[in-house]
Interface confidence: medium
Amino acid sequence: MMTGTIETTGNISAKKGGSVILQCHLSSTMAQVTQVNWEQHDHSLLAIRNAELGWHIYPAFKDRVAPGPGLGLTLQSLTMNDTGEYFCTYHTYPDGTYRGRIFLEVLESSVAEHSARFQIP
């Protein structure tokens, strides 16, 4: 039975050219996290963090994506095209698979603030 909950940074905004941290946190379960996948809105994989193999950043994103902090992901040199949904997928044992959603809005404005408040989707 899946008892866990994915908490995410929810809806966040950041300014063009800047960076942003995407974070998901799995709580309320004793399940072991075997792998975390990070995907973009069009289902393309950005990065994978395997418990035993470590991080794999996909070639198309290697210049703009940094692993961490923790199981999170840092997007750098943001462009307007980065606006959209991001998903974290937690493969766990023995629970199965959990999925969280984050919406990132990239703003032209220099006053864009990065919100890091965790939300339950």
């Epitope: 792998q35 289902h43 994978i48 035993e52 044992y93 629970d95 698979t97």
Partner: antibody
């Protein structure tokens, strides 16, 4: 060249036990997750077990949970499947397979070993 | 457990034709799907993983696509060596079930 060679298949009575082995060569065995998959006489494929590269994580479907145990010896480049309390529905060709890095899909398969459970 | 409904169960086609095989998942599996080919008396071989990624060594006439919970394997300009059985498999949750298979036969 990647090679996976299964052995240990046999005719066994219901309730009996059997241990299958899979000898791996041609790749760094300790870097890959591994799986056992079986193919029933009616040609259906059934996933049986998965073990992570270091052996810390294992997954089983409900149909074999508590009866089958997957394990590995990275020093010997060998994958195992210990099967107990065997049932007639466990009759199948058993394949060991290597998983793609960071994905659960299986990119190399052995030739299979046959297990028949019958009285 | 997630069920994978594969269709058609069998298909009789001619060399040079284009074929599409589909698998429908009983719930969202978010592109966590693979396609395999199995020839008579042989082990399965990986064709596509993560729904759309062509496996190393798989011919470019094979392609995978997704529309919601329906996944498709397309074979362009069918070759004689493409005849055999095809299976999908999902990797979501904890029970990674296969579709029932599609047997591709020469017309």
């Amino acid at each position: 060249e990647v090679q996976l060679v299964e052995s240990g298949g046999d005719l066994v009575k219901p309730g009996g036990s059997l241990k299958l082995s899979c000898a791996a060569s041609g790749f760094t065995f300790s870097s890959y997750g591994m799986s056992w998959v079986r193919q029933t006489p009616d040609k259906r494929l059934e996933w049986v077990a998965i073990i992570s590269s270091g052996g810390n994580y294992t997954y089983y479907p409900d149909s074999v949970k508590g009866r089958f145990t997957i394990s590995r010896d990275n020093a010997k480049n060998t994958l195992y499947l210990q099967m107990s309390s065997l049932k007639s529905e466990d009759t199948a060709m058993y394949y060991c397979a290597r998983q793609i890095h960071y994905f659960f899909a299986m990119d190399y398969w052995g030739q299979g070993t046959s297990v028949t459970v019958s009285s | 457990d997630i069920q994978m409904t594969q269709s058609p169960a069998s298909l009789s086609v001619s060399v040079g034709e284009t074929v599409t095989i589909t698998c429908r998942a009983s719930e969202n599996i978010y592109s966590n799907l693979a396609w395999y080919q199995q020839k008579q008396g042989k082990s399965p071989q990986l064709l596509v993983y993560a729904a759309t990624n062509l496996a190393d060594g798989a011919p470019s006439r094979f392609s995978g696509s997704r529309s919601g919970t329906q996944y498709s394997l397309k074979i362009n300009s069918l070759q004689s060596e493409d005849f055999g059985s095809y299976y999908c498999q999902h990797f979501w949750g904890t029970a990674y079930t296969f579709g029932g298979g599609t047997k591709l036969e020469i017309k």
